[in-house]
Interface confidence: low
């Protein structure tokens, strides 16, 4: 279930998912889980998950091979989730393989994680 953005598509605000024990602390930014590598087949669907939390709520950018990911209606999209952000690619093609990186910032700190789609 995607949100297909048309403006500033590389920016996805996220929820402060793990804030329950952090509410009275100063700002923080945490990578909750390293991104998973994906091995899949042509024509299938792949999902990459960027699991981050922070205060203030972080902004997430997606990159493929160091270039911002551009969404394609009904095929390649990403959106905010309750744990960060999810990138979904449908109907995989050989050109979709590569290094995918999510970069999260809360205005003070930056965290990132990289996964490989092959």
């Amino acid at each position: 279930q995607e949100t297909e953005l048309s403006v500033s598509a590389e920016l996805v605000p996220t929820s402060s998912w793990n804030i329950s024990s952090e509410l009275n602390k100063d700002s923080y930014l945490t990578l909750d889980e390293p991104m998973n590598n994906i091995t899949t087949s042509l024509g299938q669907t792949a999902e990459l998950h960027c699991k981050v939390s922070g205060n203030p709520p972080p902004t997430i950018r997606w990159f493929k091979n160091d270039a911002p990911v551009v969404q394609e209606p009904r095929r390649l999209s990403f959106r905010s989730t309750i744990y960060g952000s999810r990138l979904r690619i449908r109907n995989l093609d050989t050109t979709d393989t590569g290094y995918f990186q999510c970069v999260a910032t809360n205005g003070k700190e930056v965290v990132s994680s990289t996964g490989v789609l092959f």
Epitope: S16, H49, S80
Partner: antibody, heavy 114, light 107 residues
Framework: QVQLVQSGAEVKKPGSSVKVSCKAS????????MHWVRQAPGQGLEWMGW????????KFNHKFDGRVTITADKSTSTAYMELSSLRSEDTAVYYC???????WGQGTLVTVSS | DIQMTQSPSSLSASVGDRVTITCQAS??????LIWFQQKPGKAPKSLIY???SLANGVPSRFSGSGSGTDFTLTISSLQPEDFATYYC?????????FGPGTKVDIK
């Protein structure tokens, strides 16, 4: 095609425990959260907690005061929710739901009655 | 805990009517809100994510607006299959909390 199939209805005595299962297919359990939500008859929805089966992390609604345990068996792609010290007000339909609440199980009715 | 209130608690409407349901949070939740539809005996179905984003496969007559503490679900032209109960859910802070629901029935 994502499917969450839950175990069947249960009737329990006050003070006992119930364990409800949720088997996932078409869905990678280890890299997604699984939520549990309940709904008393004629009432609204209440979030109970989640598990992240990839590392076993869990988060609970403090309202349940330690009565809820959520586990997962990665080998069978099944999540479990156990509620202990049952009381009559725990009579409800219990649902499992995927990370973003986009897929739900069919629900399991748990009746607590003496 | 963040308290979620919905209004009205129930409403009667006719096919073709424009229906508006509001959800209010007791504190700022940004855009971290989901709207659900539930029919009797069925599991809830997500309609709107992140306050304004339509879920996959949901008809465009449904729309969401708002941020912070005040949110609205609008059905632009009510259809027979839309008679149901609607819930909002905040996922800004633990515990996640649902609104009490708004039942939409036939006038």
């Amino acid at each position: 095609q994502v499917q969450l199939v839950q175990s069947g209805a249960e009737v329990k005595k006050p003070g006992s425990s119930v364990k409800v299962s949720c088997k996932a297919s078409g869905y990678t359990l280890t890299t997604n959260y699984m939520h549990w939500v309940r709904q008393a008859p004629g009432q609204g929805l209440e979030w109970m907690g989640w598990i992240y089966p990839g590392n076993g992390n869990t988060k609970f609604n403090h309202k349940f005061d330690g009565r809820v345990t959520i586990t997962a068996d990665k080998s069978t792609s099944t999540a479990y929710m156990e509620l202990s010290s049952l009381r009559s007000e725990d009579t409800a339909v219990y649902y499992c739901a995927t990370s973003d609440f986009d897929y739900w199980g069919q629900g399991t009715l748990v009746t607590v009655s003496s | 805990d963040i308290q979620m209130t919905q209004s009205p608690s129930s409403l009667s409407a006719s096919v073709g009517d424009r229906v508006t349901i509001t959800c209010q949070a007791s504190q700022d939740i940004g855009n971290n809100l989901i709207w659900f539809q539930q029919k009797p005996g069925k599991a809830p179905k997500s309609l709107i994510y992140f306050a304004t984003s339509l879920a996959n496969g949901v008809p465009s007559r449904f729309s969401g607006s708002g941020s912070g503490t005040d949110f609205t679900l609008t059905i632009s032209s009510l259809q027979p299959e839309d008679f149901a109960t609607y819930y909002c859910l905040q996922y800004r802070e633990y515990p996640l909390t649902f609104g009490p629901g708004t039942k939409v029935d036939i006038k």
